[in-house]
């Protein structure tokens, strides 16, 4: 089945202090490799989350990425700040034998608004 | 060497509650997803009950489900199975299996270890 | 419930395969061996084909499109048990075969 990396979402809104989930699905988990979810494009773009075991304070996996056949990659992200607000990417990377892992395909985005508290 | 001890089975009552646990040893026990597999006397293998290596998803079957509850304690390396309004036809040797580095619950391909087994009993 | 054979029987020192499907579509396969009702099954293959470090190497495993099989080269009685193989459905549930018995003749 061909790869295709889908966010379904363009844009979420969500209220300072509250928690908000990015939606990632894959049509395939081949090639073999990592998926990671970044913020921003290009050179000054910001580690989220990874896939592969390292902890990410506040991001958290919504279903069981170890779970065979799982194609579910979303986040959910807790304790929004304003510092969050940005265009966050779901990326499948091809892992390399033994040069670094390549990026194969990138979700379309999704702009996370962070509203101001309601006082 | 990877060890899987499983206790709490014996003679149970109907209608009644067992708590299983099983202590492993000898790897990683929090990188690892664990499943219990239970056995009916003269019959094959049955998946019972699954969990990941976090502890955050749990995957039931469905002779057990709503009935089921299965937790871990990876800083005592222990995983239990909680079975409630025990039947007859939950009598059999419990097993506790663990996934070696693949997988979540409910993938069997990936049990690479197993227990001893503790027998249960469900009888009036 | 997966698909395998009730039985199969080879003469020692023969090649046996033993085959298993039904598993999700994207699936693997263990392969465990029983000896006797009420022992302990062992794990024989996983992930399609691992082999445990105490697992002689005359086993291995393989998967084809949906099917897995389990060869055991040159059987041995010590071989004569029980073998159940074990996947995920497509809804993520575990799942066995009914097992398959090996004879080892002679």
């Known amino acids: 089945k061909e790869l295709k990396v889908t966010q379904p979402e363009k844009s979420v809104s969500v209220a300072a202090g509250d928690s908000t989930v990015l939606n990632c699905t894959l049509t395939s988990l081949l090639p073999v490799g990592p998926i990671k979810w970044y913020r921003g494009v290009g050179q000054s773009r910001l580690l989220i989350y990874s896939f592969t075991g390292e902890h990410f304070p506040r991001v958290t996996n919504v279903s069981d990425a170890t779970k065979r056949n799982n194609m579910d990659f979303s986040i959910r992200i807790s304790n929004v700040t304003p510092e969050d607000a940005g265009t966050y990417y779901c990326v499948k990377f091809q892992k390399g034998p033994s040069e670094p892992d390549t990026e194969i395909q990138s979700g379309g985005g999704t702009e996370v608004y962070v509203l101001a508290k309601p006082s | 060497a990877v060890t899987l001890d499983e206790s709490g089975g014996g003679l149970q009552t109907p209608g009644g509650a067992l708590s299983l646990v099983c202590k492993g040893s000898g790897f990683t026990f929090s990188s690892h997803a664990m499943n219990w597999v239970r056995q009916a006397p003269g019959k094959g293998l049955e998946w019972v009950a699954g969990i990941s290596s976090d502890g955050r998803f749990t995957y039931y079957g469905a002779a057990v489900q709503g009935r089921a509850t299965i937790s871990r304690d990876n800083g005592q390396s222990t995983v239990r199975l909680q079975l409630n309004n025990l039947r007859a036809e939950d009598t059999a040797t419990y097993y506790c299996?663990?996934?070696?580095?693949?997988?979540?619950?409910?993938?069997?391909?990936?049990?690479?270890?197993w227990g001893h087994g503790t027998e249960v009993i469900v009888s009036s | 419930a997966l698909t395998q054979p009730a039985s199969v029987s080879a003469n020692p020192g023969e090649t046996v395969e033993i085959t298993c499907s039904g598993g999700g579509s994207n699936n693997a396969y263990g392969w465990f061996q029983q000896k006797s009702p009420g022992s302990a099954p062992l794990t024989v293959i996983y992930d399609n084909g691992k082999r445990p470090s105490d697992i002689p190497s005359r086993f291995s495993g393989s998967k084809s499109d949906s099917t897995g099989t389990l060869t055991i080269t040159r059987v041995q009685a010590e071989d004569e048990a029980v073998y159940y193989c074990g996947s995920a459905d497509n809804s993520g549930a575990g799942v066995f075969g009914a097992g398959t018995t090996l004879t080892v003749l002679g």
């Open positions: 299996t663990k996934n070696g580095g693949c997988g979540s619950g409910g993938d069997l391909d990936c049990i690479d270890a």
